[in-house]
Amino acid sequence: IWELKKDVYVVELDWYPDAPGEMVVLTCDTPEEDGITWTLDQSSEVLGSGKTLTIQVKEFGDAGQYTCHKGGEVLSHSLLLLHKKEDGIWSTDILKDQKEPKNKTFLRCEAKNYSGRFTCWWLTTISTDLTFSVKSSRGSSDPQGVTCGAATLSAERVRGDNKEYEYSVECQEDSACPAAEESLPIEVMVDAVHKLKYENYTSSFFIRDIIKPDPPKNLQLKPLKNSRQVEVSWEYPDTWSTPHSYFSLTFCVQVQGKSKREKKDRVFTDKTSATVICRKNASISVRAQDRYYSSSWSEWASVPCS
Amino acid sequence: RAVPGGSSPAWTQCQQLSQKLCTLAWSAHPLVGHMDLREEGDEETTNDVPHIQCGDGCDPQGLRDNSQFCLQRIHQGLIFYEKLLGSDIFTGEPSLLPDSPVGQLHASLLGLSQLLQPEGHHWETQQIPSLSPSQPWQRLLLRFKILRSLQAFVAVAARVFAHGAATLSP
């Protein structure tokens, strides 16, 4: 058993049929010694008396809010949560496996630049009685500070018959050094509590590996004289690190119709302009990637050809 | 050329070669990005490699103030990785294809280090750790980790030279 926060405790249980469970001793936070009784949740049934209460925690029915009283007055509470371990593996029932970029990916994180600011998100089908708490650091043995905000519900989607909820959190490294080569990864830890179930999820990454620039901005087309060719130009996204002579991007320019199966024109360039062939009912799209490190491409920025 | 005395390097040449290094580092092991090597207990390998750190003057302001600190750090790293790529880790079994990008990568690391430090001038170089994996699978894992780390190192070096070529070239 360990303390998650004040008056909230996590009991770690090996979860299998007829498991013996864990013996837990609760102590009432009071100077009183006599006349103390214990109850669980809303029940008035007295579970025991005395300053301590010893219980055998085997299942969710044994978890919950234990309260010690004296003469009708509440002295203190202890909330017991369960953390299940099945076949040596901690349960991951609360969050959905996003399966990208690999199986068992519960947390996904992205950064728009090298400033040390990043966003992580996760998915669940649970809509109520759900809380998250996020901590982060650079490195684990001698951790350097990363400050994370509160996790918030950022999107709701209907997937087949059930709803899916996306939560996200923004974090900022306290003393970021955008130009340095990272040697210690960022660690992100998410505590998830659903009713009386506790689970924790972690992710470890370098900012450089989660970079995904915003799409290029200000796409403009200039038809070339006596030709079907068009000069397309664009600018670096505002959110990208500066100066651009140092933090350079490379671009992919594509001309395509509505369907992915349609014929297309495509060219890669380090410049902020390119010449392509425009067709009626097609769109010109441009996306960006770090020039020197193969992290994710941005989403496409698009303008119609006509 | 960047010599210990403090003259300027051939920024444009360094830019071209460092960008080539980036391409080669990813070609040498493109799939390394799909392996989570941190799960494999990284400490003994990548803690020993020279990283370009915050105080090394490789940020735009530091380069403007005095590029020598940064160039010396990059030079150290190039020599370090050049030695690693020429070591038993890469020459031993399982043997690399004769024409694998690792060969070009090795040559280009040497080429860039010589652009930065001509013959006869000497900057301090970092000792290479004695990493001699006994099993081929250990060697393979070590190669992945070294290349992964090299990808990050050459990305910073390429940014430095691109910025230098754009803003510090005479």
């Epitope: 014929k263 297309k264 024109d265 010449t275 | -």
Partner: antibody, heavy 118, light 107 residues
């Protein structure tokens, strides 16, 4: 299966014109760009130009402007290359290509050998 | 026009050897470079697109890398069916141009 059937080899006199055909099967040429590429005996490849059969748009390499004319007939699913004022320099194999992407050549015809005699 | 220089002009190898073919552009072309194989009396066929992207149906022994001005096509353990000519082609700007080719022949 995507295939391109090119017209047979031809021997033509210097100064004459010739029209080569390239008929597609297994796909509709409107969904592709059609390119023509020239290869002289024991030599490299030269790009002549492309046509978008959907709208008739064409683009020629400067070297072939005035020498080559590309057309397409979507009803017969065929692209054509007409070469005029032939000289010995035009003796070559001419390949047609069908391309989903404009700038590289993924489906090649077998080629038509054109020999110009004086 | 962008000029592509291929080297060597001829490469004599034994089946089982691994080889690298080089293509150098007269100016930077990012990764807009494609490789073709042409066997004797056959049409060319696309091997690699955009410097390193593989093409379905092409054996995995063919790989490409490079960007800017220097590009390489590698054949890991040459097989007898690989003999022929190899061309690079740039798609960075019009007109599209090809290299003069490298002939891969039996030693």
């Amino acid at each position: 299966e995507v295939q391109l059937q090119q017209s047979g080899a031809d021997l033509v006199r210097s100064g004459a014109s010739i029209k080569l055909s390239c008929t597609a099967s297994g796909f509709n040429i409107k969904d592709y760009y059609m390119h023509w590429v020239k290869q002289r005996p024991e030599q490299g490849l030269e790009w002549i130009g492309w046509i978008d059969p959907e709208n008739g748009d064409t683009e020629y390499a400067p070297k072939f402007q005035g020498k080559a004319t590309m057309t397409a007939d979507t009803s017969s699913n065929t692209a054509y290359l007409q070469l005029s004022s032939l000289t010995s320099e035009d003796t070559a194999v001419y390949y047609c290509n069908a391309c989903k992407e404009l700038r590289y050549f993924d489906v090649w015809g077998a080629g038509t050998t054109v020999t110009v005699s004086s | 026009d962008i000029v592509l220089t291929q080297s060597p002009a001829t490469l004599s190898v034994t089946p089982g050897d691994s080889v690298s073919l080089s293509c150098r552009a007269s100016q930077s072309i990012s990764i807009n470079l494609h490789w073709y194989q042409q066997k004797s009396h056959e049409s060319p066929r696309l091997l690699i697109k955009f410097a390193s992207q593989s093409i379905s149906g092409i054996p995995s022994r063919f790989s490409g890398y490079g960007s800017g001005t220097d590009f390489t096509l590698s054949i890991n353990s040459v097989e007898t069916e690989d003999f022929g000519r190899y061309f690079c082609q740039q798609s960075n700007s019009w007109p599209l141009t090809f290299g003069a080719g490298t002939k891969l022949e039996l030693k």
